[in-house]
Amino acid sequence: TIPPHVQKSVNNDMIVTDNNGAVKFPQLCKFCDVRFSTCDNQKSCMSNCSITSICEKPQEVCVAVWRKNDENITLETVCHDPKLPYHDFILEDAASPKCIMKEKKKPGETFFMCSCSSDECNDNIIFSEEYNTSNPDLLLVIFQ
């Protein structure tokens, strides 16, 4: 819990507490913004991002965005607040400990995005069908 000598400022989104009133630590995520990538036609890839950042706000989660067009492949790694859309999409899998890529409709490119909430979880991005969360048994495994 937050002791009295630590001020609670107005609209302080740096102090986030859980249901028991304990302060929530920020996430540690890979954060290289957009970089060219060689990740293609693989079940999973490492981000090859050497920067691990402390997310600015404790409610933020790790995000990875894989994009392929006629010219190149890029991988974006960031922190982001799951209450806010990212690239116009809701982070529906933000509570997952693993970054399971899901395809999104974007004209002119192939676009996959994942989000997750364990340390540096966007370092290992997973495309494999084995992790398809439409299977409820696998959903249990992923969230354990």
């Epitope: 819990t1 859980d18 028991n20 304990a22 302060v23 929530k24 630590f25 996430q27 402390i54």
Partner: nanobody
Framework: EVQLLESGGGLVQPGGSLRLSCAAS???????RMWWVRQAPGKGLEWVS?????????YYADSVKGRFTISRDNSKNTLYLQMNSLRAEDTAVYYC?????????????WGQGTLVTVSS
């Protein structure tokens, strides 16, 4: 009883240096990730830096990268923050905190903090 006691704060001119210490007791210091957190007057908490239990990995907020260095001495149960090239915006009360293996919620134990004032 868990105790965290920060020290080393003070008044320093812009561009100067300080070294903060945090003496810990009452828990398995060498098993916990440790944090430095700061609170500027009238502002919210800012998560400054973290270090893994063995000291092998360190993390920094963008605002302090390249200027601050976190370290720990597990034999002395002490956490450190070396602060160089200090700026006026580094003025704050600095707290240390332990994050144990149970996850991202915790931080129940706070010291009284140590005040760093950067001013000419």
């Amino acid at each position: 009883e868990v105790q965290l006691l920060e020290s080393g704060g003070g008044l320093v001119q812009p561009g100067g240096s300080l070294r903060l210490s945090c003496a810990a007791s009452g828990f398995t210091f060498d098993q916990d990730r440790m944090w430095w957190v700061r609170q500027a007057p009238g502002k919210g908490l800012e998560w400054v830096s973290a270090i893994e239990s063995g000291g092998h990995r360190t993390y920094y907020a963008d605002s302090v990268k390249g200027r601050f260095t976190i370290s720990r001495d597990n034999s002395k149960n002490t956490l450190y923050l070396q602060m160089n090239s200090l700026r006026a915006e580094d003025t704050a009360v600095y707290y240390c905190a332990n994050q144990n293996k149970s996850g991202r919620s915790g931080f129940d134990y706070w010291g009284q903090g140590t005040l760093v004032t950067v001013s000419s």
